[in-house]
Interface confidence: medium
Amino acid sequence: GLQDPCSNCPAGTFCDNNRNQICSPCPPNSFSSAGGQRTCDICRQCKGVFRTRKECSSTSNAECDCTPGFHCLGAGCSMCEQDCKQGQELTKKGCKDCCFGTFNDQKRGICRPWTNCSLDGKSVLVNGTKERDVVCGPSPADLSPGASSVTPPAPAREPGHSPQDIEGR
């Protein structure tokens, strides 16, 4: 069969039906990331609380992140959410301090429970705070005579994240 003439159009162009299917460059503020496209896509505009992380080119879309005081949420930074301080989490009523027994060491995300050292048979070496997890020390057995080494503290768990909606957003 006949080859589709549009298949020869590279990324950064589109197959222009109005001009006998010749390959035309994408107009300003548009792009095509693959060959053989019949239209170019409009570039994403990073406006408002979004800022441009990567400019749009004829072959790739712009990428956004967030202006100071905000951080990205969602695939491809589809939303910007307010930062809080370490030791806080964002609720519908604003940034609230972590409850006793929980911590948040980032400007985003939720407060998470301190590590329970006793579950691993360890003691608390450094108490937890709103901003920091507890540091677990060696277990009593590790401290007995003849113990060859001290077990390092358990690694911190990956931060969980459950974004909260902000009223009036």
Epitope: Q45, C46, K47, G48, V49, R51, T52, T67, P68, G69, Q82, D83, C84, K85, Q88, L90, K93, G94, C95, K107, I166, E167, G168, R169
Partner: antibody
Framework: QVQLQESGPGLVKPSETLSLTCTVS????????VHWIRQPPGKGLEWIGV???????DYNPSLKSRVTISVDTSKNQFSLKLSSVTAADTAVYYC????????????WGQGTLVTVSS | DIQMTQSPSSLSASVGDRVTITCRAS??????VAWYQQKPGKAPKALIY???YRDSGVPSRFSGSGSGTDFTLTISSLQPEDFATYYC?????????FGGGTKVEIK
């Protein structure tokens, strides 16, 4: 309608603490941040800091050791405190709101002149 | 800190003139620039944000353009109420910084 009104003493002695209040009305605090900006007589604008609706703050590093911005949501009031003032802190002080949807100071108070002098 | 350098610092123009004010950032700020108008004894008023978007209620004779380090505010046909000082401001990174201002005077 949207209003922001700065208030506080017009004269502060050197080494004392400057305290200003910004009383707002006509909009929901949960949807906005509030910036403080100052302008020395006959000069340009200098950003002091911002408090976002969640309560987190960001300050100009040149003033950070001396400045505190806070909010009393029950009174719809924002406050600015600047400690250890000198004559160089003489300026018109403005508060301005910032919607969470765009980083722009879209409404400003009328400003209040604070003179630092003994 | 990012320095915002405005030029000219002042200009004289007549009603109906096209006026262009430029602002140069000391480093790339994307399109994270706003423009403000200030009249004597008054607070600044927002005109443009994200380099080219007019704030609500701002007349269409005001337009903004640019990205990266070079930005322009254009008044297509100067009106009597436009005689004022204009400031650019970047919000790409803290601390937020303003240009030194451009005073537009009557010729």
């Amino acid at each position: 309608q949207v209003q922001l009104q700065e208030s506080g003493p017009g004269l502060v002695k050197p080494s004392e603490t400057l305290s200003l209040t910004c009383t707002v009305s006509g909009f929901s605090l949960i949807s906005y941040g509030v910036h403080w900006i100052r302008q020395p007589p006959g000069k340009g604008l200098e950003w002091i800091g911002v408090i976002w609706s969640g309560g987190s703050t960001d300050y100009n590093p040149s003033l950070k050791s001396r400045v505190t911005i806070s909010v009393d949501t029950s009174k719809n009031q924002f406050s600015l405190k600047l400690s250890s003032v000198t004559a160089a802190d003489t300026a018109v002080y403005y508060c301005a709101r910032n919607p969470l949807t765009a980083t722009v100071m879209d409404y400003w108070g009328q400003g209040t002149l604070v003179t630092v002098s003994s | 800190d990012i320095q915002m350098t405005q030029s000219p610092s002042s200009l004289s123009a007549s009603v109906g003139d096209r006026v262009t004010i430029t602002c140069r950032a000391s480093q790339n700020v994307g399109t994270n620039v706003a423009w403000y108008q200030q009249k004597p004894g008054k607070a600044p008023k927002a005109l443009i944000y994200s380099a080219s978007y007019r704030d609500s209620g701002v007349p269409s004779r005001f337009s903004g353009s640019g990205s990266g380090t070079d930005f322009t505010l254009t008044i297509s046909s100067l009106q009597p109420e436009d005689f004022a000082t204009y400031y650019c401001q970047q919000y790409n990174s803290y601390p937020l910084t303003f240009g030194g201002g451009t005073k537009v005077e009557i010729k």
